[in-house]
């Protein structure tokens, strides 16, 4: 932190020492408490980190995340015949990403225009709620997917309606849980006018009363309950999965599955290392430093970590790719600008010419393919 006359910089949810209690007018009406922004805070709010770096990253996330997750959701809902538990979890993962990413144009505009929020209090709260909601939804659905992948290897039994219903029930429970845990983000006033900068910030400036105690406790609880515990479950599932795959007999098909499983594990590990661990760790450290020392020395790291956490919306499609045969086909053909139907017809035509007596493994009238679970 840059040395200043007033030591009240509070970081993102930056700032916010309220020097004294809220004022009470003669009519007994409490005037809205105002928030501390000092020289350091003002530098951050006008600096290149928030006005250049963040919008660049968010633009990349939006450009990559919106079409890839949009296509994934479409594939899982309309192009996958059997709704396996994995499909259900991935569909929810894609939906969570979409619900977060659709607001990014507002977020990008906000940062480009010097952290000036012009879209109203309600939209700011929605943006912040969805921002954190997406991160915690992603962690939980990724955990479900990881445990389910392990379960499939342990119990390679056929798809049952009961398993799909359980997956739907778990998914609904996750959405409800995330809605409940993000309520504080919707309730708290997130927009604050900063006169010196002539800007209205969204989430970047919050009152100290909220910050010091409540914010630390809030994010610590989330880090333990919605990050550490699911992370432990995910890690356990993959460790056990690797053990199982190592000990199993290897034919050509099993080798393919093993390689895909390893790629999936590496992708999820990358997501934890890039997106979830730094953001959750720094959320706790950042608010702990504010609580204990009155200022955060890790503010820049914290901003970068929170920004990188949004990259999960770009990494999730790789998970779909390694898990879903359907998504793989659609992704490959989307990149090659071909329709799946055309490819299927070509494959059918080739197959019928080569093996006229053998039945084709694909149906030309259907775009559905057998998914490997």
């Amino acid at each position: 932190t840059i040395q200043g006359t007033n030591r009240s910089s509070k970081g993102r949810s930056l700032i916010g020492k309220v020097d004294g209690t809220s004022h009470v007018t003669g009519k007994g009406v409490t005037v809205e408490t105002v928030f501390s922004v000092d020289e350091f805070s003002a530098s951050v709010l006008t600096g290149k980190l928030t006005t250049v770096f963040l919008p660049i990253v968010y633009t990349i996330v939006f450009v990559v995340g919106l079409p890839s997750n949009g296509m994934a959701l479409w594939v899982f809902l309309f192009r996958t015949k059997k709704k396996h538990p994995a499909v259900i979890y991935m569909a929810n993962l894609a939906l969570a990403d979409l619900l977060s990413v659709i607001w990014f144009p507002l977020k990008i505009a906000y940062h480009i225009h010097g952290n000036n929020w012009i879209y109203g209090e309600a939209l700011c709260n929605v943006l912040i709620g969805f921002f954190y909601g997406n991160m915690y939804c992603s962690i939980l659905f990724m955990t479900c997917l990881s445990v389910q992948r392990y379960w499939v290897i342990v119990n390679p039994m056929g798809h049952s309606r009961k398993k799909a219903n359980i997956a739907i029930g778990i998914s609904l429970a996750i959405w409800l849980l995330i809605l409940l845990v993000t309520i504080p983000l919707y309730v708290v006033k997130q927009t604050i006018f900063i006169p010196a900068l002539n800007i209205t910030t969204c989430h970047d400036v919050l009152p100290e009363q909220l910050l010091v105690g409540d914010m630390f406790n809030y994010f610590l609880s989330l880090a333990i309950g919605v990050f550490l515990f699911p992370a432990f479950l995910t890690a356990s599932a993959y460790v056990l999965m690797i053990r199982m795959l190592r000990s199993s007999a290897m034919d050509e098909n099993s080798e393919k599955k093993r390689k895909r499983a390893i790629k999936l594990i590496v992708t999820v590990l990358a997501m934890y290392l890039i997106c979830f661990t730094p953001s959750n760790l720094l959320l706790v450290v950042h608010y702990f430093l504010i609580k204990s020392q009155g200022q955060s020395h890790v503010y820049a790291l914290y901003i970068v970590a929170l920004c990188l956490s949004t990259l999960n919306s770009c990494i999730d499609p790789f998970v779909y790719y390694f898990v879903s045969h359907d998504f793989r086909d659609h992704a490959k053909n989307a990149l090659l600008c071909r329709s799946v139907r055309t490819v299927k017809q070509m494959q059918v035509s080739l197959t019928s010419k080569k093996h006229s007596r053998k039945s084709s493994s694909y149906s030309s009238s259907s775009t559905t393919v057998k998914t490997s679970y």
């Epitope: 200043g4 805070s41 003002a42």
Partner: antibody, heavy 121, light 107 residues
Framework: EVQLVESGGGLVQPGRSLKLSCVVS????????MTWIRQAPGKGLEWVAS????????YYPDSVKGRFTISRDNAKSTLYLQMNSLRSEDTATYYC??????????????WGQGTLVTVSS | DIQMTQSPHSLSASLGETVSIECLAS??????LAWYQQKPGKSPQLLIY???SLQDGVPSRFSGSGSGTQYSLKISNMQPEDEGVYYC?????????FGGGTKLELK
């Protein structure tokens, strides 16, 4: 001890230009916003221009916008005010201030002794 | 622009007396108000910021209050060194504006 010393004032004809300087000492210059405030003879105070500690953002009232330019050289701990197209109503003592940003606003905490600018033909 | 109107234009006070200067903003300024003192032939100095916060080194006999559009500066136990012109300033909306000033003299 915080010190701000303005210079560059004097008599100038209308339409001409003048550049004021403010050399500071006693504090880390690049940590603070700086402002120019003027006071016409026997009159009240008028805010002229403000600049952020990095120099990246500047703020002006409509009365001087497009004519005056505030800038800073953090290496030299010096604040500048370039005044172009001067008018008789710009006649005033120009003060350089070191600001405090508290609760998101600018408060003029330390003032220089001022430099007199007289615009007259 | 936000207009700042100070009253009275001038006043005299005896030693030890308590005096009050008012400042009215043309619109609500959410407590973003400062008070400055300018002694004859000197530069102004900050007394109070954010309506009621005392600047470092300023005697505690100076106090500020108010909210919305109405603010006041109170000087209890008037001293000879308190003579001068007092200005209010709003830091809520650009352009920053000042009141016309209140001249305080010792009786």
């Amino acid at each position: 001890e915080v010190q701000l010393v303005e210079s560059g004032g004097g008599l100038v004809q209308p339409g001409r230009s003048l550049k004021l300087s403010c050399v500071v000492s006693g504090f880390t210059f690049n940590n603070y916003w700086m402002t120019w405030i003027r006071q016409a003879p026997g009159k009240g105070l008028e805010w002229v221009a403000s600049i952020t500690n990095s120099g990246g953002n500047t703020y002006y009232p409509d009365s001087v916008k497009g004519r005056f330019t505030i800038s800073r050289d953090n290496a030299k701990s010096t604040l500048y005010l370039q005044m172009n197209s001067l008018r008789s109503e710009d006649t005033a003592t120009y003060y350089c201030t070191r600001d405090r940003i508290i609760r998101g606003s600018t408060w003029f905490a330390y003032w220089g002794q001022g430099t007199l600018v007289t615009v007259s033909s | 622009d936000i207009q700042m109107t100070q009253s009275p234009h001038s006043l005299s006070a005896s030693l030890g007396e308590t005096v009050s200067i008012e400042c009215l903003a043309s619109e609500g300024i959410s407590n973003y108000l400062a008070w400055y003192q300018q002694k004859p032939g000197k530069s102004p100095q900050l007394l109070i910021y954010y309506a009621s916060s005392l600047q470092d080194g300023v005697p505690s006999r100076f106090s500020g209050s108010g909210s919305g559009t109405q603010y006041s500066l109170k000087i209890s136990n008037m001293q000879p060194e308190d003579e001068g012109v007092y200005y209010c300033h709003q830091g809520y909306k650009y352009p920053w504006t000042f009141g016309g000033g209140t001249k305080l003299e010792l009786k």
